[in-house]
């Protein structure tokens, strides 16, 4: 059993405020921000993260650069506005009334526009492409173990059914991690590939979301791997739509 | 479904030796910070020891060198051989598995650990 039942706490997620107030005394919790209950046994979504994030601002984080073959999470920080079941709307707006649409991670995927600006649907985020860059190490990492122990990682960690991690790509120091997961292919109760790298960006940060005070502790083959660059793209099953001026600034 | 059951415990005699168990499915022991805690009556749950997922082991400072704490990949058993047990060891033993690749922090606490077995009780008579 876990430490929920004993302590009324969230094992998956430390931005939330639980008490025993659920049916027949269970524990219940509840994310910041948003008030909305989450399932502890699993990953809460990124859109319900980031409003519990923004109702507990802390430094800025520094952005990624851009990538003229996929999305990457330029814009940075927003407080966003979730769908009853934690996903991002498709449109976003800030207070100055200034919007924009996403994909299903929560990133920018049209120009900013006014209020008028519509979004018919949420675009899937089909393919992340996380790659990082790791330490210095005695030598190279053994490929089939690293490949092994990232795909442990993200089963046992994050609860990704395995289907999902496509490939691990490494040369030293360079390590791929893709995850692919096709709105077809995701059923319900599993874990959207778009959480499980929300969570993970935020491990290799130092910035669990997991209750305990421990981290991330990863390592190949007793060798902790330690991250010193992560960059993460987003590639949708519609295309982005950037005017020109934009690709060309 | 990650499960802990815990065995071994018992009666023994002051001086005495003990062997706890704790078998572990759902969940790889070797990648993340497992423990044992104990809990007397009417005291609180306090850290006995913790195994890293590197192989290193931490003892609270009343069992240092009278307690270890090893796990088995292969079996993906962790145990907790006693030794010289007191009067004082009497308790309910848990044991306890953080989030999976999760680290040991000092002090432990019990806040860090999301799995728990049932418990095992063991006794030290004088």
């Known amino acids: 059993h876990t430490a929920a039942q004993d302590n009324c706490t969230c094992p998956t997620n430390k931005m939330t405020v639980c008490s025993p107030d659920g049916p027949g005394g269970r524990c219940q919790c509840r994310a910041l921000g948003s008030g909305m209950a989450v399932d502890c046994s699993t990953l809460t979504s990124k859109c319900l993260l980031l409003k519990a994030r923004m109702s507990a601002p802390k430094n800025a984080r520094t952005l990624v650069r851009p990538s003229e073959h996929a999305l990457v999470d330029n814009d940075g920080l927003y407080d966003p506005d979730c769908d009853p079941e934690g996903r991002f709307k498709a449109r976003q707006c800030n207070q100055t009334s200034v919007c924009w649409c996403v994909n299903s991670v929560g990133v920018r995927r049209t120009d900013k526009g006014d209020l008028s600006l519509r979004c018919d649907e949420l675009v899937r985020t089909h393919h992340i492409l996380i790659d990082l860059r790791h330490r210095p190490t005695a030598g190279a990492f053994n490929h089939s173990d690293l490949d092994a122990e990232l795909r442990r990682l993200f089963r046992e960690r994050y609860r990704l059914h395995p289907k999902f991690v496509a490939a691990v790509h490494y040369e030293q120091p360079t390590i791929q991690i893709e995850l692919r997961q096709n709105t077809s292919q995701k059923a319900a109760g599993d874990v959207d590939i778009g959480d499980a790298a929300y969570y993970f960006e935020r491990d290799i940060k130092g910035e669990s979301l997991f209750q305990g005070r421990g981290g991330l502790d990863l390592r190949v083959r007793g060798e902790p791997l330690q991250v010193e660059r992560t960059l993460i793209y987003y590639l949708d099953e519609i295309p982005p739509k950037f005017s020109m001026k934009r690709l060309t600034a | 479904q990650v499960q802990l059951q815990e065995s071994g415990g018992g009666s023994v005699q002051a001086g005495g030796s003990l062997r706890l168990s704790c078998a572990v499915s759902?969940?790889?022991?070797?990648?993340?910070?497992m423990g044992w805690f104990r809990q007397a009556p009417g005291k609180e749950r306090e850290g006995v020891a913790v195994?890293?997922?590197?192989?290193?082991?931490t003892a609270a400072d009343s069992v240092k060198g009278r307690f270890t704490i090893s796990r088995d990949n292969a079996k993906n058993t962790l145990s907790l051989q006693m030794t010289s047990l007191k009067p004082e060891d009497t308790a309910m033993y848990y044991c306890?598995?953080?989030?999976?690749?999760?680290?040991?922090?000092?002090?432990?606490?019990?806040?860090?650990?999301?799995?728990w077995g049932q418990g095992t009780q063991v006794t030290v008579s004088s």
């Open positions: 195994i890293r997922s590197s192989g290193e082991t």
């Open positions: 759902g969940l790889t022991s070797s990648t993340t910070c």
């Open positions: 306890a598995a953080a989030w999976p690749y999760s680290g040991c922090l000092l002090p432990l606490s019990s806040g860090d650990f999301t799995y």
